[in-house]
């Protein structure tokens, strides 16, 4: 009685029970009544990442500098290559296809997450207390001068986007 | 329809090198295996060796030094080539492939002088 | 070099009659898979062999059933349930474990 299924890493080709090829390998000739499941190595630059019948191995991913993009794993017969964007950019998909420019935080943001190849800056609103007075990809808000610990006075208060200016307490005249 | 074809001198003389063709249709070479297998008159079978469809080779090892198989997949034939032939290398030569029960029809090779 | 051993060597039956015939490996036949590559070959006269049988006991399509074959590790049988004329000529076991493949010496199956 031929199989209707067949084990983990088998297939069922003409009523009978073949071994997947693993990975690294594609599918040359599937197994016969005399034979096992004949399969080869992927060539230079293919892989296949899976047990499979696959005839044909997948290129690896090309990290094109044009596009920003530069390798960041370089890929084996049975991964492929992990591309990763090049300083100051990052991808504009998790499949990192391609790359944009950092965005940097206005005049009033500062930066909660610095970006990495994978993720844009996250920027945040400055808290009162705190400013950002320049656009930067780097740059947190700072906080406010503490005009007191300089035995200074607020001469003007602060916003989101300048510090406070501080100066020389009046004095009381004789 | 799957088809194996033999084609050869049917006399060789001794000391030469025998060159035998199998031509193949219904199917292709890069993904299914061919053997070889010989049958001296009134005698048992013998497996010379095969070629497999990713182009690798086993050879029977009393013949190996003999023998070469190679392919052509473009010309859809396999070739079997024996050389420094005896008497006792006188047999039907069939190819086979390697499922199923495809054989060619066989072709007699005699080595005399 | 693996080596297939057959008997008997003539095996004289009356039609209708069962028959039986062994092949003895030299060494196991289970691959590393599992499987067992041991095979069953006719051969009738002026013709190519057949194949009967193949991985111990597995028929052959438009093999008919009262062909059956059994067997593990270097131990096999072929067995013809009631023997019919057309089943006259030399059974060959075969092997594809190992290479080289080998065939046994042949039991040759007339009718008494």
């Known amino acids: 009685e031929p199989p209707t299924a067949c084990r983990e890493k088998q297939y069922l080709i003409n009523s009978q029970c073949c071994s997947l090829c693993q990975p690294g390998q594609k599918l040359v000739s599937d197994c016969t009544e005399f034979t096992e499941t004949e399969c080869l190595p992927c060539g230079e630059s293919e892989f296949l990442d899976t047990w499979n019948r696959e005839t044909h191995c997948h290129q690896h991913k090309y990290c094109d500098p044009n596009l920003g993009l530069r390798v960041q794993q370089k890929g084996t017969s049975e991964t492929d290559t992990i591309c990763t964007c090049e300083e100051g950019w990052h991808c504009t998909s998790e499949a990192c296809e391609s790359c944009v420019l950092h965005r940097s935080c206005s005049p009033g943001f500062g930066v909660k997450q610095i970006a990495t190849g994978v993720s844009d800056t996250i920027c945040e609103p400055c808290p009162v207390g705190f400013f950002s007075n320049v656009s930067s990809a780097f740059e947190k808000c700072h906080p406010w001068t503490s005009c007191e610990t300089k035995d200074l006075v607020v001469q003007q208060a602060g916003t989101n986007k300048t510090d406070v200016v501080c100066g020389p307490q009046d004095r009381l005249r004789a | 329809q799957v088809q194996l074809q033999e084609s050869g001198p049917g006399l060789v003389k001794p000391s030469q090198t025998l060159s035998l063709t199998c031509t193949v249709s219904?199917?292709?070479?890069?993904?299914?295996?061919v053997y070889w297998v010989r049958q001296p008159p009134g005698k048992g079978l013998e497996w010379i060796g095969m070629m497999w469809g990713g182009g690798s080779t086993d050879y029977n090892p009393s013949l190996k030094s003999r023998l070469t198989i190679s392919k052509d997949t473009s010309k859809s034939q396999v070739s079997l080539k024996l050389s420094s032939l005896t008497a006792a290398d006188t047999a039907v030569y069939y190819c086979v492939r390697t499922d199923g029960d495809y054989w060619g029809q066989g072709t007699l090779v005699t080595v005399s002088s | 070099e693996l080596q297939l051993t057959q008997s008997p060597l003539s095996l004289p039956v009356t039609l209708g009659q069962p028959a039986s015939i062994s092949c003895r490996s030299s060494?196991?036949?289970?691959?590393?898979?599992?499987?067992?590559?041991l095979h069953w070959y006719l051969q009738r006269p002026g013709q190519s062999p057949r194949l009967l049988i193949y991985k111990v006991s597995n028929r052959f399509s438009g093999v008919p059933d009262r062909f059956s074959g059994s067997g593990s590790g270097t131990d096999f049988t072929l067995k013809i349930s009631r023997v019919e004329a057309e089943d006259v000529g030399v059974y060959y076991c075969s092997q594809s474990t190992h290479v080289p493949w080998t065939f046994g010496g042949g039991t040759k199956l007339e009718i008494k």
């Open positions: 060494q196991s036949l289970a691959s590393s898979s599992g499987n067992t590559y």
């Open positions: 219904g199917f292709s070479l890069s993904r299914y295996s």
